[in-house]
Amino acid sequence: IWELKKDVYVVELDWYPDAPGEMVVLTCDTPEEDGITWTLDQSSEVLGSGKTLTIQVKEFGDAGQYTCHKGGEVLSHSLLLLHKKEDGIWSTDILKDQKEPKNKTFLRCEAKNYSGRFTCWWLTTISTDLTFSVKSSRGSSDPQGVTCGAATLSAERVRGDNKEYEYSVECQEDSACPAAEESLPIEVMVDAVHKLKYENYTSSFFIRDIIKPDPPKNLQLKPLKNSRQVEVSWEYPDTWSTPHSYFSLTFCVQVQGKSKREKKDRVFTDKTSATVICRKNASISVRAQDRYYSSSWSEWASVPCS
């Protein structure tokens, strides 16, 4: 058993049929010594008496709010949550496996630049009685500070018969050094509580590996005289790290016909312009990637040829 926050405790349980559970000692936070009784949640049944109480916790019916009383007055509360371990593996019932980039990916994180700011998100089908708390650091043995905000519901989607809820959080490394080579990874830890169930999820990464630039901005076409060719130009996204001479991007320019089956013409360039042939009803799209490190491509920025 360990304390998650004031008066909230997590009991770690091996979860199998007829498991004996854990013996937990509860102490009433009071200077009183005598006449103390204990109840669980809203039950009128008295569980026991005394300043300390030893209880057996083996299922969710044993979790909840334990209250000590004296003469009708509430003295203190202890909320017990359960963290289940089945076959040596902690339960992951609350969050959905996103399966990208690999199985058992519950947290996904991205950064738009090297400033030390990043966003993580996760999915669940649970809509109520759900709370999240996020902590982060760089390194784990001698951790350096990363400050995370509150997790917020960022999207709702319908997936077949189920509704899916996306939560996200923004974090900022306290003393980020954008140009430095990373040697210790960022660690992100999410505590999830659904009703009386506790779970925790972690992710470990280097900022360089989760970089995904915003799409190029100000995408423009300039027809070339007496030609089917156009000059496509764009700019670095505002959110990308500066100076651009050091934090450089490379670009992919694509000409795509109206039909998805039509052949795509692609050009790769380090410049912020390219000359392509603009077919009727086609569109031109440009995306960006860090020039010196193969992290994710940005989403496409697009304009129609016409």
Partner: nanobody, 114 residues
């Protein structure tokens, strides 16, 4: 009619063990909160241990790690396994359907003495 009949008490030396039984009739133990309480000579009733309908237990600090409450649903019987007995465990032991011991049996005497 609800009946609770305790048995298994006796005289035992310090450090010894006893197993108390409580045969219940007129109701099913498995759906009930059940308690062991005791009354030492010249003292009031003292709570010892509780078993909830789900089989989970609670016990007083004074008996922690020494006494174990359990039940056999098929026999509709409640038990108290008492190990490492001390002279201060000497008391009349009752099984009860309520914490205050209002609905209890006639009790079984446990005396711990050398």
């Amino acid at each position: 009619e609800v009946q609770l009949v305790e048995s298994g008490g006796g005289l035992v030396q310090p450090g010894g063990s006893l197993r108390l039984s409580c045969a219940a009739s007129g109701f099913t133990l498995s759906g009930s909160w059940m308690y062991w309480v005791r009354q030492a000579p010249g003292k009031g009733l003292e709570w010892v241990s509780t078993i909830k309908p789900n089989g989970s237990t609670a016990s007083a600090d004074s008996v922690k790690g020494r006494f174990t409450i359990s039940r056999d649903n098929a026999k509709n019987t409640l038990y108290l396994q008492m190990n490492s007995l001390k002279p201060e465990d000497t008391a009349l032991y009752y099984c009860a359907r309520d914490f205050s011991g209002n609905q209890r049996g006639q009790g079984t005497q446990v005396t711990v003495s050398s």
